[in-house]
Interface confidence: low
């Protein structure tokens, strides 16, 4: 058992039939010693009287809010919250796997530049009784830190007969050095309580693994006299890491039309401008990717062929 | 060619043959994303390689100010990987295939590390970790840890170089 | 300066009670997880009890529970051991140790600071 | 209950030469969040316990650096580089990983 916050625990469970549990001890947080009663929840049940009350906790009815009393008054409470371990494997029933980029990945995160600032999302199917809290550090045995601000609902989606709840988070190193080279993963730490259950889920990342430019900007086609060839032109997204001399980007440059099943032109390039051959309702796009490391691209940004 | 003394670095050089080795170094292990080396207990093997770290004056303000701090630096990374990729993790068995990646960027890590070295001037290197896995297994393992950070390594001293080369070079 | 100060040992007949204060200074008591660790002469550490910043959970080692109640004061910055039914083998020196986040998962605490012990010797 | 099992439970060292003390615990000390829940306390004769590494391998503040600790799982190891004659005492290992919290039987380290 452990302290979640004041007056909130997490009572660690091995989840199987006719597991003991864990015995607890409450304490009354009071200088009195006479007349104390407890209640757990909404119920005015007396589950005991006197400054402690030991309990067994086996299962979710036996979590929840206890709360002792003296004549009539509230004293204190204690929130007992359940985090399940079946076959030695703690529970991940809140979150929704999202698979990519392998199994088991609940946390998903992304940065636009080196500026140790960063965004990390997560789904879930349940739509309250729902809290998160993150905390993030670069390092775990000496953390050097990072600053989270709060899980927000970002966005819903219908899958199915499913509702889907994407819930995203900004963090933001304290004393970030975008020029440096990584040595120490930074850690994501996401406390998931759902009614009166706890979960935790971890990601752990460099920001070069994480990087992922917004989409070049400005992109515009300029049509070269007397041929069927145009010079696209683009600019570095406003977000990323500047001065461009050192953070430099790389440029994949399509042209594609109507059909999907049409043959694909690609160039790649160094520069912010190409030439290429304009056929008719195709469209061109350009994304971007660090130069020098292969992290992700960038979304496409486009523009049409007429 | 050199250094001499504190003197500049053929910048446009360095860019070109540090830009190579990142290609290189992508191409010798290409599905970093498709292996979390970090689960697979990191203690003794790439621990002990050097940094480029904030102190180091590889940003772009440090460069302005005395790029020899950093060229020091990355001349002490690229002797240390090279010898790293020159050792028996990367010559014994599971032999690399004849095509492999591994040789050239070898070769264009001692290339670039000469670039740097000034003239009848040694900078102090890094000592390397003894390092000698038993099992091929953990040889293998060994190599996608060492490229990877490698990955990392030459990302950076590719970013001095081109900045040097767009506004350091006389 | 951080300290840890254990009172209220002595001597005590089987079956007696005593009651052992520890007063902390020099960091904010009421952030830490206290513990107290006796040892037996000549022998190891053990491990007797255990509470929570704020005090709304404590734990118990097998030996002692139902007999001892630990509980705090974090108004008065004092840390508190009740012994009931005292047993020749509950003779022992008692340290209280205080207890540190380690900068990993949130329940992880380890004993930095401890006091310089008070002796319970339980005798007829 | 979790044991802790320490060795040697006597270590006789010359001054200047590095020691060795292993724990072992009946079930593992690791978490799944990736932290050993194991520290090392050293207990200098007439003195109370003070602990020198926390989490299997950090120092402890004010710790000299020829204390270091390694291991994972249920085999732990406490190494000093050089031993200097103020070392002495008794070791002892002890699991957080689930109460009762336990120590191991403490290994006596003195000066030949």
């Known amino acids: 058992i452990w302290e979640l916050k004041k007056d909130v625990y997490v009572v660690e469970l091995d989840w199987y039939p006719d597991a003991p549990g864990e015995m607890v001890v409450l304490t009354c947080d009071t200088p009195e010693e006479d007349g104390i009663t407890w209640t757990l929840d909404q119920s005015s049940e007396v589950l005991g009287s006197g400054k402690t009350l030991t309990i067994q906790v086996k299962e979710f009815g036996d979590a929840g809010q206890y709360t002792c009393h003296k004549g009539g008054e509230v004293l204190s409470h204690s929130l007992l919250l359940l985090h399940k371990k079946e076959d030695g494997i703690w529970s991940t029933d809140i979150l929704k796997d999202q698979k990519e980029p392998k199994n088991k990945t609940f946390l998903r995160c992304e940065a636009k530049n080196y500026s140790g600032r960063f965004t990390c999302w997560w789904l879930t199917t349940i739509s309250t009784d729902l809290t998160f809290s993150v905390k993030s550090s670069r390092g775990s045995s000496d953390p050097q830190g990072v600053t989270c601000g709060a899980a927000t609902l970002s966005a819903e989606r219908v899958r199915g007969d499913n509702k889907e709840y994407e819930y995203s988070v900004e963090c933001q190193e304290d004393s970030a050095c975008p020029a440096a080279e990584e040595s120490l993963p930074i850690e994501v730490m996401v406390d998931a309580v759902h009614k009166l259950k706890y979960e935790n889920y971890t990601s752990s990342f460099f920001i070069r693994d994480i990087i992922k430019p917004d989409p070049p900007k400005n992109l515009q086609l300029k049509p070269l006299k007397n041929s069927r060839q145009v010079e696209v032109s683009w600019e570095y997204p406003d977000t990323w890491s500047t001065p461009h001399s050192y953070f430099s980007l790389t440029f994949c440059v399509q042209v594609q039309g109507k059909s999907k099943r049409e043959k694909k032109d690609r160039v790649f390039t160094d520069k912010t401008s190409a030439t290429v051959i304009c056929r008719k309702n195709a469209s061109i796009s350009v994304r971007a990717q660090d130069r020098y490391y292969s992290s992700s691209w960038s979304e496409w940004a486009s523009v049409p062929c007429s | 060619r050199a250094v001499p003394g504190g003197s500049s670095p053929a910048w446009t050089q360095c860019q070109q043959l540090s830009q190579k080795l990142c290609t290189l170094a992508w191409s010798a292990h290409p599905l970093v994303g498709h292996m979390d080396l970090r689960e697979e207990g990191d203690e003794e093997t790439t621990n002990d390689v050097p940094h480029i770290q904030c102190g180091d004056g590889c940003d772009p303000q440090g460069l302005r100010d005395n790029s020899q701090f950093c060229l020091q630096r990355i001349h002490q990374g690229l002797i240390f990987y090279e010898k790293l990729l020159g050792s028996d993790i990367f010559t014994g068995e599971p032999s690399l295939l004849p095509d492999s990646p591994v040789g050239q960027l070898h070769a264009s890590l001692l290339g670039l590390s000469q670039l740097l070295q000034p003239e009848g001037h040694h900078w102090e290197t890094q000592q390397i970790p003894s390092l000698s896995p038993s099992q091929p297994w953990q040889r293998l393992l060994l190599r996608f840890k060492i490229l990877r950070s490698l990955q990392a390594f030459v990302a950076v001293a590719a970013r001095v170089f081109a900045h040097g080369a767009a506004t350091l070079s006389p | 300066e951080v300290q840890l100060l254990e009172s209220g040992g002595g001597l005590v007949q089987p079956g007696g009670s005593l009651r052992l204060s520890c007063a902390a200074s020099?960091?904010?008591?009421?952030?830490?997880?206290m513990q107290w660790v006796r040892q037996a002469p000549g022998k190891g550490l053990e491990w007797v009890s255990s509470?929570?910043?704020?005090?709304?959970?404590?734990l118990y080692a097998d030996s002692v529970k139902g007999r001892f109640t630990i509980s705090r004061d974090n108004s008065k910055n004092t840390l508190y051991l009740q012994m009931n039914s005292l047993r020749a083998e509950d003779t022992a020196v008692y340290y209280c140790?205080?207890?540190?986040?380690?900068?990993?998962?949130?329940?992880?605490?380890?004993?930095?600071?401890w006091g310089k012990g008070t002796t319970v010797t339980v005798s007829s | 209950d979790i044991q802790m099992t320490q060795s040697p439970l006597s270590l006789p060292v010359t001054p200047g030469e590095p020691a060795s003390i292993s724990c072992r615990s009946s079930?593992?000390?690791?978490?799944?969040?990736?932290?050993?829940?194991l520290d090392w306390f050293l207990q200098k004769p007439g003195q109370s316990p003070q602990l020198l590494i926390y989490?299997?391998?950090n120092r402890a503040s004010g710790v000299p650096d020829r204390f270091s600790g390694s291991g994972s799982g249920t085999d732990f190891t406490l190494k000093i580089s050089r031993v200097e004659a103020e070392d002495v005492g008794v070791y002892y290992c002890?699991?957080?990983?689930?109460?009762?919290?336990?120590f191991g039987q403490g290994t006596k380290l003195e000066i030949k």
């Open positions: 509470i929570w910043s704020s005090g709304g959970i404590t």
């Open positions: 002890m699991q957080a990983r689930q109460t009762p919290y336990t």
């Open positions: 989490m299997g391998s």
């Open positions: 079930q593992s000390l690791l978490h799944t969040h990736g932290y050993n829940y």
């Open positions: 020099g960091f904010t008591f009421s952030d830490y997880p």
């Open positions: 140790a205080r207890g540190t986040h380690g900068g990993g998962p949130p329940w992880y605490y380890y004993m930095d600071v």
